[in-house]
């Protein structure tokens, strides 16, 4: 019970993680305008991944798409390729992870194949999850970097009448909804991994035993009937993947690298 | 068609309050802001302020922050400018206009003006 | 504030002729965010309110006869009549539309030579 709660619980979480990373790619307000001890302007600049965004006094609104790709900076489109990757490892994740759901039967299907399914589904949400975390922190560096180089412009060579004022970039709601929904793909794929291994069908070495049954006899060997039978392995499963633990320890060294901002 | 009548002409002497009002038709009141420009005789004219008759919310121009008080009566599709601590300074003609939706926040129609003089 | 100047504070111009005033701001008026100035130009007559002619420096308002054009970018601004007619003599204001407070130019006053 504790084990298809897990399961179900990793990937509703997974689940909300993915449509958030979705909705944070698809968002357009990855940098917005620095309000702060800047001239005010009566409109107000935003950017997403794929295109930026102004809004007058008025409500009016204007986007335009970032319709080059060879005239973009490498970041962005890295950042790009990231939460796309996201996106996709995610998406697979969620169609592997329905099937190994141990509440969904499907056909005569084995204990050990939804317990390989679910872990796969773990790892794919964990480095989906990585993939959102480092796309969303990569611009997130990039953004404080701009931020300060921009702000040094700001405060230099004043001496004569200042011709412009260089408008500066802050974090937008959608770095926000990124680290959250990947952290919530993290979570449901470390509990994915963990669902595994309680799902993992127990290997009992049983010796071989002659039944007698109404004058001729039958030999069942070991592992010739199946779980999905009822008979056989011991439902309540016992560890067996250590692969899952290592994934766990793998989950907790990988982010460091991607800790930018 | 888009209309902002405004109040009559006013005489007031140094140290008083004036009130003009603006009402507006032909458009969804709610969904415009209305800014109040000043044009003193002979003289150009001056950005007073702005106020968003959906919210009430207001930007002053900082020159005018403590004496200009902008309110709206959604009622009656009226804005209201009170200019308080009148100086001579302060005769001008008062314009309410309406800003332009994706028009670069310009305004695209204007009151007819109201004449405010100020002396003793 | 930005400072709005605008030249000459007077112009007198044939019928018929070009007419060309100018408007410089004190800081770019260029938004890089859609590449679009936010400078407005009215037309004032003797004892009216103003009227919208130009907005982002160069769209001209829906009514304003072509003969009108706005043209700059950054902090240099131009409006040009090129066939005056009676009807525009009036008092031509730029404006500051992109930071607080507005602010605009002192006018410009177009007469008939």
């Known amino acids: 019970m504790a084990v298809t709660a897990c399961q179900g619980l990793g990937f509703v979480v997974s689940l909300i993680g993915i449509a958030g990373i979705i909705a944070a790619t698809c968002m357009d307000q990855w940098s917005t305008q620095d309000l702060y001890n800047n001239p005010v302007t009566a409109v107000f600049n935003y950017q997403g991944l794929w295109r930026s965004c102004v809004r007058e006094s008025s409500g009016f609104t204007e986007c335009r798409g970032y319709f080059t790709l060879l005239g973009l900076p490498a970041m962005l489109q890295a950042v790009r390729a990231l939460m796309i990757v996201g996106i996709v490892l995610g998406a697979i994740g969620l169609l592997v992870s329905i099937f190994a759901l141990k509440c969904i039967r499907i056909g005569s299907m084995e204990d050990s194949a939804k317990a390989n399914m679910t872990l796969t589904s773990g790892i794919m949400f964990i480095v989906s999850g990585l993939c959102a975390i480092a796309g969303v922190s990569v611009f997130a560096n990039m953004l404080v970097t701009n931020f300060w180089m921009s702000t040094a412009n700001m405060y230099t060579g004043m001496g004569g009448m200042v011709q412009t004022v260089q408008t500066r970039y802050t974090f937008g709601a959608a770095l926000f909804v990124g680290w959250v929904a990947g952290g919530l793909t993290l979570i449901g794929g470390v509990m994915m991994c963990i669902a595994c291994r309680g799902l993992a069908p127990e290997e009992t070495n049983y010796k071989a035993v002659s039944y007698h049954a109404s004058g001729h006899s039958v030999a069942y060997k070991p592992g010739g009937f199946k779980a999905s039978t009822g008979f056989g392995s011991n439902t309540k499963n016992k560890k067996i993947y250590d692969g899952g633990a290592r994934t766990e320890d793998e989950v907790q060294s990988y982010p460091s690298k991607h800790d930018y901002v | 068609q888009v209309q902002l009548v405004q109040s009559g002409a006013e005489v007031k002497k140094p140290g008083a309050s004036v009130k003009v009002s603006c009402k507006a038709s032909g458009y969804i009141f709610t969904n415009y802001w209305i800014h109040w420009v000043r044009q003193a005789p002979g003289q150009g004219l001056e950005w007073m302020g702005r106020?968003?008759?959906?919210?009430?919310?207001?930007y002053y121009n900082e020159k005018f922050t403590g004496r200009v008080t902008m309110t709206r009566d959604t009622s009656t599709s009226t804005v209201y400018m009170e200019l308080s601590s009148l100086r001579s300074e302060d005769t001008a003609v008062y314009y309410c206009a309406r800003e332009g939706y994706g028009k670069g926040n310009s305004m695209d129609y204007w009151g007819q003006g109201t004449t405010v003089t100020v002396s003793s | 504030d930005i400072v709005m100047t605008q030249s000459p504070d007077s112009l007198a111009v044939s019928l018929g002729e070009r007419a060309t005033m100018n408007c410089k701001s004190s800081q770019s008026l260029l938004n890089a965010g859609n590449q679009k100035n936010y400078l407005t130009w009215y037309q004032q007559k003797p004892g009216q309110p103003p009227k919208l002619l130009f907005y982002?420096?160069?769209t001209r308002e829906s009514g304003v006869p072509d003969r009108f054009s706005g043209s700059g970018s950054g902090t240099d601004f131009t409006l040009t009549i090129s066939s005056l007619q009676a009807e525009d003599v009036a008092v031509y204001h730029c404006?500051?539309?992109?930071?607080?407070?507005?602010?605009f130019g002192g006018g410009t006053k177009l007469e008939i030579k």
């Open positions: 106020i968003y008759p959906g919210t009430g919310n207001t």
């Open positions: 982002w420096a160069s």
């Open positions: 404006q500051n539309a992109y930071y607080y407070p507005y602010t």
